[in-house]
């Protein structure tokens, strides 16, 4: 806590400007008006303050807004955001996507911090659902964001938001998450034609049931092995050799290299040897 001292004569800051880097901590506390700071927060980011000086500025804002900062201040926090604790952020009501972007930009290139996680949580809860624009923004900054959500949280994602999801955004999703996302993707892309539909749905197929895989096998989709290996084992097991052959097309030869790995291994064990032999790959059931 910085002790309360009177501002020396001639040192009262008329504005937030570049001269403040030469103020000692106690001078900042005594000579910078908190209300002035709040209205000129946009200037703070351009001034090379020390971490200790930023602590003083934060303290002044905390005193001015004990119930939490208004969005007009939050939007211009800049590097001061890095000084905020999750407890501070829980007091905020952030509704503007521009504010969210501005704060994510400050943390860009770093792992998702507890502060950022809290900010996103507050923002999404405030919006009521994970809409397309929000998802677009979050996955642009954190490609793994979607897969960091629980299946329960993912259930609030409207199908329309699925259009914002890129294949790399699903790289770290587990089957439980894909189980939630797949039906939404199916709904979102339902009006697309066969080949375009497959391109879009491919990343979500780890949550597809058997009947959908059977349907895809009738459409000459030529699924690659990487996608096939991510399918749910329980969805792959009921597929016939002919259906898998149609599903994979020219990629069927890749089964040989994966014969010891799930779901290929389990699927092979469920097939008649005669049927497997029709593939000519030397697969042993």
């Amino acid at each position: 806590e910085v002790e309360k001292t009177a501002c020396p004569s001639g040192k009262k800051a008329p504005e937030i400007d570049e001269s403040l880097i030469f103020y000692k901590k106690w001078e900042l506390e005594a000579c910078v008006d908190a209300a002035l700071l709040a209205t000129q927060m946009d200037r703070v980011n351009a001034i090379p303050f020390t971490y200790e000086q930023l602590d003083v500025l934060k303290h002044k804002l905390d005193e001015l807004y004990p119930q939490g900062y208004p969005e007009s201040v939050i939007q211009h926090l800049g590097y001061l955001f890095l000084k905020m604790s999750p407890e501070d952020i829980r007091k905020w009501n952030v509704t503007s996507l521009e504010t969210l972007k501005a704060l994510l930009e400050v943390n860009k290139g770093h792992e998702m911090s507890p502060q950022v996680a809290t900010l996103i949580d507050r923002f999404v809860k405030g919006r009521g659902q994970l809409d397309k624009d929000t998802l677009d923004t979050l996955t642009a900054f954190y490609p793994g964001y979607l897969c960091s959500l629980s299946p329960e949280e993912l259930s609030s994602v409207p199908p329309s938001s699925i259009w914002a999801v890129r294949p790399q955004d699903l790289d770290t999703c587990d089957p439980r998450q894909l189980d939630v996302l797949y039906p939404k993707a199916r709904l979102a892309f339902q009006n697309m034609n066969g080949s375009e539909y497959f391109v879009k749905i491919q990343s979500f197929l780890g949550g597809a049931p058997t009947e959908d895989l059977k349907a895809l096998s009738q459409q000459n989709v030529s699924m690659d092995l990487a996608t096939f290996m991510k399918l749910r084992t329980d969805a792959v097991l009921p597929l016939t050799v002919a259906e898998v052959q149609k599903l994979l097309g020219p990629h069927v030869e890749g089964l040989k290299a994966e014969e010891r790995h799930r779901p290929v291994r389990d699927w092979i064990l469920r097939q008649r040897q005669d049927d497997l032999d029709t593939l000519g790959l030397g697969l042993q059931g």
Partner: antibody, heavy 120, light 112 residues
Framework: QVQLKESGPGLVAPSQSLSITCTVS????????ISWVRQPPGKGLEWLGV???????NYNSALKSRLSISKDNSKSQVFLKMNSLQTDDTARFYC??????????????WGQGTSVTVSS | DVVMTQTPLSLPVSLGDQASISCRSS???????????LHWYLQKPGQSPKLLIY???NRFSGVPDRFSGSGSGTDFTLKISRVETEDLGVYFC?????????FGSGTKLEIK
């Protein structure tokens, strides 16, 4: 382009005060600070003071009591006032732009200076 | 106030030679924000000073690469790799880490 131009009286009587104006163009005083520097004949540079973008000032410790810097952003002018001049205040007075953004407080552009002689 | 001490006061050189000017400060010029606000200026005869190097080692626009700055803390050096006629004049170091800002006393670069 960036320009700074000082205008002063040239000659000042001892014990009188000096007023110099620095008129700038090519940039705004609300975005850049201005320093005043003087140079006695054949000597080195002496920093007098600075006026920051917000209007705050800092001064040379030894001359603080005699100096006052102010500005008029709308007219793009900065003013230096120095009281109680003596003959050893004879010098060339420069105004210079402090670039705190890209150049981190260095003085990147200087005026041509105005010569001030203190003599009766 | 921070005192800036420059050596030598005068530096006679032959054209094409390397020149080295030293600047020492009475206290560290590392600001609490991590930056070191040490700058070099050149004043040619009859002209205003001009910025050469800012923040220890960054050349200002238009400054030839034969000029280089180095140093840290309290000890700094300006080097001119091959002196040319247009380099003659008085070189000043200056600090803007602490207010009041201060200049060194100057080093006159002249022909031997």
């Amino acid at each position: 382009q960036v320009q700074l131009k000082e205008s002063g009286p040239g000659l000042v009587a001892p014990s009188q005060s000096l007023s110099i104006t620095c008129t700038v163009s090519g940039f705004s005083l609300s975005s850049y600070a201005i320093s005043w520097v003087r140079q006695p004949p054949g000597k080195g540079l002496e920093w007098l003071g600075v006026i920051w973008t917000g209007g705050g000032t800092n001064y040379n410790s030894a001359l603080k009591s005699r100096l006052s810097i102010s500005k008029d952003n709308s007219k793009s002018q900065v003013f230096l006032k120095m009281n109680s001049l003596q003959t050893d205040d004879t010098a060339r007075f420069y105004c210079a732009r402090n670039n705190y953004g890209r150049l981190d407080y260095a003085m990147d552009y200087w005026g041509q200076g105005t010569s001030v002689t203190v003599s009766s | 106030d921070v005192v800036m001490t420059q050596t030598p006061l005068s530096l006679p050189v032959s054209l094409g030679d390397q020149a080295s000017i030293s600047c020492r400060s009475s206290q560290s010029l590392v600001h609490g924000n991590g930056n070191t606000y040490l700058h070099w200026y050149l004043q040619k005869p009859g002209q205003s000073p001009k910025l050469l190097i800012y923040k220890v080692s960054n050349r200002f626009s238009g400054v030839p690469d034969r000029f280089s700055g180095s140093g840290s803390g309290t000890d700094f050096t300006l080097k001119i790799s091959r002196v040319e006629t247009e380099d003659l004049g008085v070189y000043f170091c200056s600090q803007s880490t602490h207010v009041p800002f201060t200049f060194g006393s100057g080093t006159k670069l002249e022909i031997k």
